[in-house]
């Protein structure tokens, strides 16, 4: 069965999951000067499947333009894809000093709220 | 002290909080036909104050355009302002039937994730 090809089941390909990317330490805003790259893991994707009745109605109201909300603080009508666990990341700075930053990278994600 | 006016302290006026609005039942997407209004409470506002080291670095990476993320699923670099408690809401439909919808309105908010 594992080798048989079949029609793909409908899955939320954009669903909440852990993603990773090589990024320059200099772009992390840590205040450490470094030319190194590190692997940064983060969470992104949709949490539509986990919506409550409140969320469904909120989405309906937002879609209908029926809710007034302050500029820049539009309410969120689904749980958020957020890290549930973190890990430390280490790198070498320009002075060849080994630096470790706790809770920098995500190691697990969940639909929260 | 309660009656004294003083120079405003810098506070997060746009912070995560409970808001309320009268909305038409017809805009709630419940499948019930009704021209009534109900009071709908929802959560909105910023959770910037609760950001972790991961969030700060994620925000820095996003700001620098250093992260690739799938269209429509940009990662969130702060906890989400979401309901932590809900309440039922009741209304009259067009047939004068009293309807109650559980968990429709928020009663408390928090910065989650």
């Amino acid at each position: 069965a594992g080798t048989r090809s079949s029609r793909a089941r409908t899955t939320d390909a954009r669903g909440c999951r852990l993603r990773s990317q090589l990024v320059p330490v200099s772009a992390l805003g840590l205040g450490h000067s470094s030319d190194e790259l590190i692997r940064f893991r983060f969470c992104s994707g949709s949490c539509r499947r986990a919506r409550s009745q409140h969320d469904l109605s909120l989405a309906s109201l937002l879609g209908a333009g029926a809710l007034r909300s302050p500029p820049g603080s539009r309410p969120i009508s689904q749980p958020c894809c957020r890290p549930t666990r973190y890990e430390a990341v280490s790198f070498m700075d320009v002075n060849s000093t080994w630096r470790t930053v706790d809770h920098l990278s995500a190691t697990a994600c969940g639909c929260l709220g | 002290a309660g009656t004294r006016s003083s120079r405003a302290r810098t506070t997060d006026a746009r912070g995560c909080r409970l808001r309320s609005q009268l909305v038409p039942v017809s805009a709630l997407g419940l499948g019930h036909s009704s021209d009534e209004l109900i009071r709908f409470r929802f959560c909105s506002g910023s959770c910037r104050r609760a950001r972790s080291q991961h969030d700060l670095s994620l925000a820095s990476l996003l700001g620098a355009g250093a992260l690739r993320s799938p269209p429509g699923s940009r990662p969130i670099s702060q906890p989400c302002c979401r309901p932590t408690r809900y309440e039922a809401v009741s209304f009259m439909d067009v047939n004068s039937t009293w309807r109650t919808v559980d968990h429709l309105s928020a009663t408390a908010c928090g910065c989650l994730g």
Partner: antibody, heavy 122, light 107 residues
Framework: EVQLVESGGDLVQPGGSLKLSCAAS????????MHWVRQASGKGLEWVGR??????????EYGASVKGRFTISRDDSKNTAYLQMNSLKIEDTAVYYC?????????????WGQGTMVTVSS | DIQMTQSPSSLSASVGDRVTITCRAS??????LNWYQQKPGKAPNLLIY???TLESGVPSRFSGSGSGTDFTLTISSLQPEDFEIYYC?????????FGQGTKVEIK
């Protein structure tokens, strides 16, 4: 647009009667309670009374100062509420507001009319 | 009847000031407390519902807090349009009652 419009305010002599109307538009109020609140010139707000919805058998309650003299009624088919005022006194002189209170675990005066002036004077 | 006592009855402040108005109930009313603003010649307008919920469309500089018998309305940074009269109101018991009002005036 959601609104309430009061009418019927007038100058009346002490001991006289007056009937105020409150018409709702832009929504249906049959599931809501209808309240009346008044405000004498330069004074604070005073709750007059309310009529509840059909589910609560259109029960009415009144403030102590008007009990036995004022009667609140409603006609849901016309989306209109009424305040019948009898045995009017000089101290009943005020702006009268009708207010919708939608159902909720905690209630508030949600939608206010613009007010209608009742003057009791000889 | 539940008595609602507001203080102060009036206050003078300047644009940009932080202002706090208090409301005390004669018995516990949980969070069955609403705040209204009234402009001259107009009906009151709901600002804060259920002690602390900001009514949509009301600026975020307004906030409410409290439970039981003691409540506060705070305006974090007074704006010119905020110089009006404010009322608290309880909906815990019939008859619903209001505070006597607080007039916020320009210093």
């Amino acid at each position: 647009e959601v609104q309430l419009v009061e009418s019927g305010g007038d100058l009346v002599q002490p001991g006289g009667s007056l009937k105020l109307s409150c018409a709702a538009s832009g929504f249906t109020f049959s599931g809501s309670a209808m309240h009346w609140v008044r405000q004498a010139s330069g004074k604070g707000l005073e709750w007059v009374g309310r009529i509840r919805n059909k589910v609560h058998r259109y029960a009415t309650e009144y403030g102590a100062s008007v009990k036995g003299r004022f009667t609140i009624s409603r006609d849901d088919s016309k989306n209109t509420a009424y305040l019948q005022m009898n045995s009017l006194k000089i101290e009943d002189t005020a702006v009268y507001y009708c207010v919708v209170v939608v159902p909720g675990s905690i209630e508030a005066f949600d939608i206010w009319g613009q007010g209608t002036m009742v003057t009791v004077s000889s | 009847d539940i008595q609602m006592t507001q203080s102060p009855s009036s206050l003078s402040a300047s644009v940009g000031d932080r202002v706090t108005i208090t409301c005390r109930a004669s018995q516990s009313i949980s969070t069955y407390l609403n705040w209204y603003q009234q402009k001259p010649g107009k009906a009151p307008n709901l600002l804060i519902y259920a002690a602390s919920t900001l009514e949509s469309g009301v600026p975020s500089r307004f906030s409410g807090s409290g439970s039981g018998t003691d409540f506060t309305l705070t305006i974090s940074s007074l704006q010119p349009e905020d110089f009006e009269i404010y009322y608290c109101q309880q909906s815990y018991n019939i008859p619903w009652t209001f505070g006597q009002g607080t007039k916020v005036e320009i210093k």
